[in-house]
Interface confidence: low
């Protein structure tokens, strides 16, 4: 049994996750994550599914966060800014956006790095999943510590 | 006894810290902090050591965060971006990077201000210390509220 | 009775809020918020007052955060950067700044989007209110998820 599981007692175990970005050849705008490096996965009440979403088993309030570092150039990118979105998919419901951040591309060449941080408190239902979307995954920086995603149950 | 200490009972006291940036003449890349202004230090289970690192006495999951505001100019700075790193030093272990953020320098003159926010959930061992590194401490803004560092135990 | 209220027992109910930005015709620099969309208001121990401030009934340590996305242009704006401030008003005290972030305006036209995230742990007294100030509210982005404000009691 995971040591975190017992810290608050069986009725109210600690639930937290922190996962690390993973470069992907997929063309999807959903970022990919892995349990690697200095990751956190407190117990089986939160899981990383298909490398793309954190799924919780218990209803409650969660602080959910994501950090995305990216490198882009104004001339080489579309006119639209780089947008990172924290999204929610609850069982039997449509996906919805919880949080977004937008940064205009840099004029630096070949590209300019910028970091985005998202975070907020949301109620999640049992089986709810959260994931991170970006406008251009190829611009995301995957060096140590630059891009990560996590949550903690209050 | 600090009033925070007892809020969750002796077995599970509240542990939290929030410290304020301090300008330093030191040439080190490690930022300096102080218990001044509207700071938080819940009890002696977390301490600020040597003005540079937050050290915890109890093992567990912590949400750790840092905010750094800096002012830099592309022409006056190195080509490398401004990088802020949240780092961990555990007893008997090498230092490691937990989180990083990178922002390309501004073209604004004399310098352009930017703010970085880092935050994530990590397991800390007893005696573990966390600290913040930046590429150029002379560019950091120390005005009220601009640069701070903290943690809370889940 | 709200389901969150009971999760920690009557003595220590969960206290958390997450509110969504609201465009305002007011000329004040204080941002306006609403309980709309995917908002959180755990119980009556935290309330949104006058659409502008989160007010707490219980003393304790709170993690308070705000995210502001804005769109500005260097030529059309004042020389001063865009600054977002998280402020505290406690009963019988002057207002004070808890956290600030500053971003120099973009050279992109008509305007360049940028996102700011603020967050930290602070002690609040009963009746204390927190609110968010910005240098130019007309530049704030109110699209889904871009600008939000919240807190959670440790």
């Amino acid at each position: 049994e995971n040591s975190f599981e017992m810290q608050k007692g069986d009725q109210n175990p600690q639930i937290a996750a922190h996962v690390i970005s993973e470069a992907s050849s997929k063309t999807t705008s959903v970022l990919q994550w892995a349990e690697k490096g200095y990751y956190t996965m407190s117990n089986n009440l939160v899981t990383l599914e298909n490398g793309k979403q954190l799924t919780v088993k218990r209803q409650g309030l969660y602080y959910i966060y994501a950090q995305v570092t990216f490198c882009s150039n104004r001339e080489a990118s579309s006119q639209a800014p780089f947008i990172a979105s924290l999204c929610l998919k609850s069982p039997g419901r449509f996906e919805r956006i919880l949080l977004r951040a937008a940064n205009t591309h840099s004029s630096a060449k070949p590209c300019g790095q910028q970091s985005i941080h998202l975070g907020g408190v949301f109620e999640l239902q049992p089986g709810a999943s959260v994931f991170v979307n970006v406008t251009d995954p190829s611009q995301v920086s995957h060096g140590t510590g630059f891009t990560s995603f996590g949550l903690l149950k209050l | 006894e600090n009033s925070f200490e007892m809020q969750k009972g002796d077995q599970n006291p509240q542990i939290a810290a929030h410290v304020i940036s301090e300008a330093s003449s030191k040439t080190t890349s490690v930022l300096q902090w102080a218990e001044k202004g509207y700071y938080t230090m819940s009890n002696n289970l977390v301490t600020l050591e040597n003005g540079k690192q937050l050290t915890v006495k109890r093992q567990g999951l912590y949400y750790i965060y840092a905010q750094v505001t800096f002012c830099s100019n592309r022409e006056a700075s190195s080509q490398a971006p401004f990088i802020a790193s949240l780092c961990l030093k555990s007893p008997g272990r090498f230092e490691r990077i937990l989180l990083r953020a990178a922002n390309t320098h501004s073209s604004a003159k004399p310098c352009g201000q930017q703010s970085i926010h880092l935050g994530g959930v990590f397991e800390l061992q007893p005696g573990a210390s966390v600290f913040v590194n930046v590429t150029d401490p002379s560019q950091v803004s120390h005005g009220t509220g601009f640069t701070s560092f903290g943690l809370l135990k889940l | 009775e709200n389901s969150f209220e009971m999760q920690k027992g009557d003595q220590n109910p969960q206290i958390a809020a997450h509110v969504i930005s609201e465009a305002s015709s007011k000329t004040t620099s204080v941002l306006q918020w609403a309980e709309k969309g995917y908002y959180t208001m755990s119980n009556n121990l935290v309330t949104l007052e006058n659409g502008k401030q989160l007010t707490v009934k219980r003393q304790g340590l709170y993690y308070i955060y705000a995210q502001v996305t804005f769109c500005s242009n260097r030529e059309a704006s004042s020389q001063a950067p865009f600054i977002a401030s998280l402020c505290l008003k406690s009963p019988g005290r002057f207002e004070r700044i808890l956290l600030r972030a500053a971003n120099t305006h973009s050279s992109a036209k008509p305007c360049g989007q940028q996102s700011i995230h603020l967050g930290g742990v602070f002690e609040l007294q009963p009746g204390a209110s927190v609110f968010v100030n910005v240098t130019d509210p007309s530049q704030v982005s109110h699209g889904t998820g871009f600008t939000s404000f919240g807190l959670l009691k440790l």
């Epitope: - | 001044k36 | 005290r93 700044i97």
Partner: nanobody
């Protein structure tokens, strides 16, 4: 021992200026808030201005734009520059602090009972 000593008061005509000083000893002023209060004859003591440990300043509505608070950490002294003085500014002016309150002592209060240490006061009279 914590000590505060005010100076700079006096008689001045309406529209004139004065600069009050509050010299602190026994503690490092820069880590704590210093508040200026005033008490007019027959009235309660009221908060006028404050400078917090990190340098943020606050003013009561009636003096905004006329009074400026500042601090010289090297001299361990806080100043209150009073311009465009009015007869209703006539009062004994006190500075106050409370380094015993830890981090709460670094923040500004409007209520005098929140401060543990007071100077002896300096009289400001605005009259023609």
């Amino acid at each position: 021992e914590v000590q505060l000593v005010e100076s700079g008061g006096g008689l001045v005509q309406p529209g004139g200026s004065l600069r009050l000083s509050c010299a602190a000893s026994g503690f490092t002023l820069e880590y704590y808030a210093i508040g200026w209060f005033r008490q007019a004859p027959g009235k309660e003591r009221e908060g006028v201005s404050c400078i917090s440990s990190e340098g943020s300043t606050s003013y009561t509505d009636s003096v905004k734009g006329r009074f400026t608070i500042s601090r010289d950490n090297a001299k361990n002294t806080v100043y209150l520059q009073m311009n465009s003085l009015k007869p209703e500014d006539t009062a004994v002016y006190y500075c106050a602090t409370d380094p015993d309150r830890g981090f709460l002592g670094s923040s500004c209060d409007t209520q005098s009972h929140q401060y543990g240490y007071w100077g002896q006061g300096t009289l400001v009279t605005v009259s023609s």
